[in-house]
């Protein structure tokens, strides 16, 4: 049995512009005021951190300036958007949620969202 329950969609298809959005929802045992959300990518047996943000409940998520992620929060729900994706980035994206404050610390891991990215076909030259 996992710790805190975290739900995320099983599959998401990235747009032709390489943008994928999904909701990560967690069941908080109590009234957390500081939450950390991390997106992890699992490919084969390798897990790498894609992006992370800490936010105060009621405030916006703030990712680093050079992050490929953006997001908004509403209650126990986080809307995540990953940009700049290419076909090679297809994989399982796991949402990790940590309740940082007040103590006690709680952790939850989602089952992952399989994001499929298809590189757009280059436009053929057209003669008019």
């Amino acid at each position: 049995c996992k710790a805190m329950h975290v739900a995320q969609p099983a599959v998401v298809l990235a747009s032709s512009r390489g943008i994928a959005s999904f909701v990560c929802e967690y069941a908080s045992p109590g009234k957390a005021t500081e939450v950390r959300v991390t997106v992890l990518r699992q490919a084969d047996s390798q897990v790498t951190e894609v992006c992370a943000a800490t936010y105060m409940m009621g405030n916006e998520l703030t990712f680093l300036d050079d992050s490929i992620c953006t997001g908004t929060s509403s209650g126990n729900q986080v809307n995540l958007t990953i940009q700049g994706l290419r076909a090679m980035d297809t994989g399982l994206y796991i949402c990790k949620v940590e309740l940082m404050y007040p103590p006690p610390y709680y952790l939850g891991i989602g089952n992952g969202t399989q994001i499929y990215v298809i590189d757009p076909e280059p436009c053929p030259d057209s003669d008019f």
């Epitope: 049995c1 996992k2 710790a3 329950h5 069941a27 908080s28 045992p29 109590g30 009234k31 992890l40 897990v47 796991i94 990790k96 940590e98 940082m100 007040p102 103590p103 006690p104 610390y105 709680y106 952790l107 891991i109």
Partner: antibody
Framework: EVKLDETGGGLVQPGRSMKLSCVVS????????MNWVRQSPEKGLEWVAQ??????????YYSDSVKGRFTISRDDSKSTVYLQMNNLRAEDMGVYYC??????WGQGTLVTVSA | DIQMTQSPASLSASVGETVTITCGAS??????LNWYQRKQGKSPQLLIY???NLAEGMSSRFSGSGSGRQYSLKISSLHPDDVATYYC?????????FGGGTKLEIK
């Protein structure tokens, strides 16, 4: 100040029962999952049982070594968590700690199982 | 069940030295790891939570690192007061298993 105060330990014969209690103050009891963890010289720290809170339907979890013999329960109105221990064995001996999440720990109560 | 393997089982170092204790999980625990300090005759105290976060009231000489299956606890500039047994614990999934402990002594 956070306080977790365990009581109910002592000497008990193998096969008999014992009930531990833990009264909590200083943090919001109903917002938290409560655990019992035991410490013995042979096994070090060993998690025993967990009870979650209302948002998690008061789900309970047990280590394989105590499943079917121990029962964890809670009374949110009294900020108290309990551990009912039946059919006690020599290997159940140790200091039993009540924990809030795994952040806050009580001072422990000693359980001795001996004929 | 996730197994936690801690090493070394015991360790002796001099005041002022830096020591490292390691903890390995039998599978990826995604940073779901706590470290505890238990002094003789006292209750365990949370030292590090979520692999890297220092618990309230604990000295900044303690630091945690690691990810995946491998984690470590570093104690810098060892003090006599650091004599204790240190435990790691999986906090990702039940059963919430502990490592076997590392007993730290001062030379």
């Amino acid at each position: 100040e956070v306080k977790l105060d365990e009581t109910g330990g002592g000497l008990v014969q193998p096969g008999r029962s014992m009930k531990l209690s833990c009264v909590v103050s200083g943090f919001t009891f109903s917002d938290n999952w409560m655990n019992w963890v035991r410490q013995s010289p042979e096994k070090g720290l060993e998690w025993v049982a967990q009870i979650r809170n209302k948002p998690y339907n008061f789900e309970t979890y047990y280590s394989d070594s105590v499943k079917g013999r121990f029962t964890i329960s809670r009374d949110d109105s009294k900020s108290t968590v309990y551990l009912q221990m039946n059919n006690l064995r020599a290997e159940d001996m140790g200091v039993y700690y009540c924990t809030g999440g795994f952040t806050y720990w009580g001072q422990g109560t000693l359980v001795t199982v001996s004929a | 069940d996730i197994q936690m393997t801690q090493s070394p089982a015991s360790l002796s170092a001099s005041v002022g030295e830096t020591v490292t204790i390691t903890c390995g999980a039998s599978e990826n625990i995604y940073g779901g790891l706590n470290w505890y300090q238990r002094k003789q005759g006292k209750s365990p105290q949370l030292l590090i939570y979520g692999a890297t976060n220092l618990a309230e009231g604990m000295s900044s000489r303690f630091s945690g690192s690691g990810s995946g299956r491998q984690y470590s606890l570093k104690i810098s500039s060892l003090h006599p007061d650091d004599v204790a047994t240190y435990y790691c614990q999986n906090v990702l999934s039940s059963p919430w298993t502990f490592g076997g402990g590392t007993k730290l002594e001062i030379k």
